[in-house]
C-alpha cells in the first residue's frame, strides 16, 4: 500500500546548467490528479525548487517563472531543471502526491545528487 518513488542517484548537469532526470512512482491507487514537487536538501534544510499538479494523461505545467519543465507518461515524470550553477550542486528530491481521488498518498524518492560545474570563461582571442 505504501507509495514508492524511484529516481537516479546521480546526474551531471550539462555545460548550459541544465539537468534532467526521471522520477517514477509505484501508485497504490488509481490517481487522476498528481502533484510532483522537486525539493532541494542542503544540510538539514529542505526547500522547494518547483512543483506542478497535473491530470493523468495531460501535460505537466509548471509556473511560468519556474526553473523546471517536465513531461509525464503514465507513472513516470521526466523532469528538467534549468539555470543551475556550481553553487546549486546538491541533493534534489522528487516528491509525488496522489491528490485525487481519495485516499491521499505521498511518496518521496531518495534524491538525485546533481553536480553542476560552471563552464570556464572563454579566453580572449586577438
Amino acid at each position: 500500500k505504501a507509495m514508492h518513488v524511484a529516481q537516479p542517484a546521480v546526474v551531471l548537469a550539462n555545460s548550459r546548467g541544465t539537468a534532467s532526470f526521471v522520477c517514477e512512482y509505484a501508485s497504490p491507487g488509481k490517481a487522476t490528479e498528481v502533484r510532483v514537487t522537486v525539493l532541494r536538501q542542503a544540510d538539514s534544510q529542505v526547500t522547494e525548487v518547483c512543483a506542478a499538479t497535473y491530470m493523468m494523461g495531460n501535460e505537466l505545467t509548471f509556473l511560468d517563472d519556474s526553473i523546471c519543465t517536465g513531461t509525464s507518461s503514465g507513472n513516470q515524470v521526466n523532469l528538467t531543471i534549468q539555470g543551475l550553477r556550481a553553487m546549486d550542486t546538491g541533493l534534489y528530491i522528487c516528491k509525488v502526491e496522489l491528490m485525487y481521488p481519495p485516499p491521499y498518498y505521498m511518496g518521496i524518492g531518495n534524491g538525485t545528487q546533481i553536480y553542476v560545474i560552471d563552464p570556464e570563461p572563454c579566453p580572449d582571442s586577438d
Epitope: 500500500k1 507509495m3 525539493l39
Partner: antibody, heavy 118, light 107 residues
C-alpha cells in the same frame, strides 16, 4: 523563528459552534500545508484535519467530517477551524501544526483548550 | 485507514538504561513514519522522521529503525529529561494516524 499561535478556545454547550484560529509567523505560510491535531484530557494525539498550502485540498478525520471545516487566509497568515454541532467528545486541546515539505509535523502551536459541556 | 499500534503503553526504566518502543502499522507504510516526544504539560516535538532520520537538534541517544510495518524507537541511555510520552505517526497516506502513545518514566 517559526511560530504558530492558536486562539478561540473556550467553554461551549453541546450542539453549539466555535471557531479556532492559528496565526503563523516566521515562515512562508502560503508554501505549507497546515494540520489541526487534538488531544483529549489525559489521552493521546488525534489528527483532525489538513488544508493544502493554497487551500485547494482539504482532508478530515471521520470523527469530525461534516461538522468541522478547515480554511485559511494566506493574506493574513492565518488558519481556521470552524467547529459546528459540537459534542462532549470534542473536548480537547487543539493544536495547529505545520506539515513539513518531507511530510511530518515539524512545528506545533501551544494549543487552545475547547471544553464542550452543558 | 492505517492503524498504528505502540507497545508497551508505559514503561519504567533507570537512568542510563537502553529503552526500546515499538510501533506496528496495520499495513505497509515504507519508511513514512515519524516519532514525537511530548513532555508533561508541553507541546509535541518531532524527534525522528523517515523512520530513522533525526530531526535537527535532537540528541544522538535517540534513534529509529524499521520499514514496512514494524518500527522501533530506541533511547540508548535514558536521561531524566527523557520522561515523556512518545507517539509514532504514519504520514504515508491520509488520515495521518498516530499510535496511542508510550509513557516513559524513571524508576
Amino acid at each position: 523563528q517559526v511560530q504558530l499561535v492558536e486562539s478561540g478556545g473556550g467553554v461551549v454547550q453541546p450542539g453549539r459552534s466555535l471557531r479556532l484560529s492559528c496565526a503563523a509567523s516566521g515562515f512562508t505560510f502560503s508554501s505549507y500545508g497546515i494540520h489541526w491535531v487534538r488531544q483529549a484530557p489525559g489521552k493521546g494525539l488525534e489528527w483532525v484535519a489538513v488544508i493544502w498550502y493554497d487551500g485547494s485540498n482539504k482532508y478530515y478525520a471521520d470523527s469530525v467530517k461534516g461538522r468541522f471545516t478547515i480554511s485559511r487566509d494566506n493574506s493574513k497568515n492565518t488558519l481556521y477551524l470552524q467547529m459546528n454541532s459540537l459534542r462532549a467528545e470534542d473536548t480537547a486541546v487543539y493544536y495547529c501544526a505545520r506539515g513539513s515539505l518531507l511530510g511530518p509535523f515539524d512545528y506545533w502551536g501551544q494549543g487552545t483548550l475547547v471544553t464542550v459541556s452543558s | 485507514d492505517i492503524q498504528m499500534t505502540q507497545s508497551p503503553s508505559s514503561l519504567s526504566a533507570s537512568v542510563g538504561d537502553r529503552v526500546t518502543i515499538t510501533c506496528r502499522a496495520s499495513q505497509g507504510i515504507s519508511n513514512y513514519l515519524a516519532w514525537y516526544q511530548q513532555k508533561p504539560g508541553k507541546v509535541p516535538k518531532l524527534l525522528i522522521y523517515a523512520a530513522s532520520t533525526l530531526q535537527s537538534g535532537v540528541p544522538s541517544r535517540f534513534s529509529g529503525s524499521g520499514s514496512g510495518t514494524d518500527f522501533t524507537l530506541t533511547i540508548s541511555s535514558l536521561q531524566p529529561e527523557d520522561v515523556a510520552t512518545y507517539y509514532c505517526q504514519n504520514y504515508n497516506s491520509a488520515p495521518w494516524t498516530f499510535g496511542q502513545g508510550t509513557k516513559v518514566e524513571i524508576k
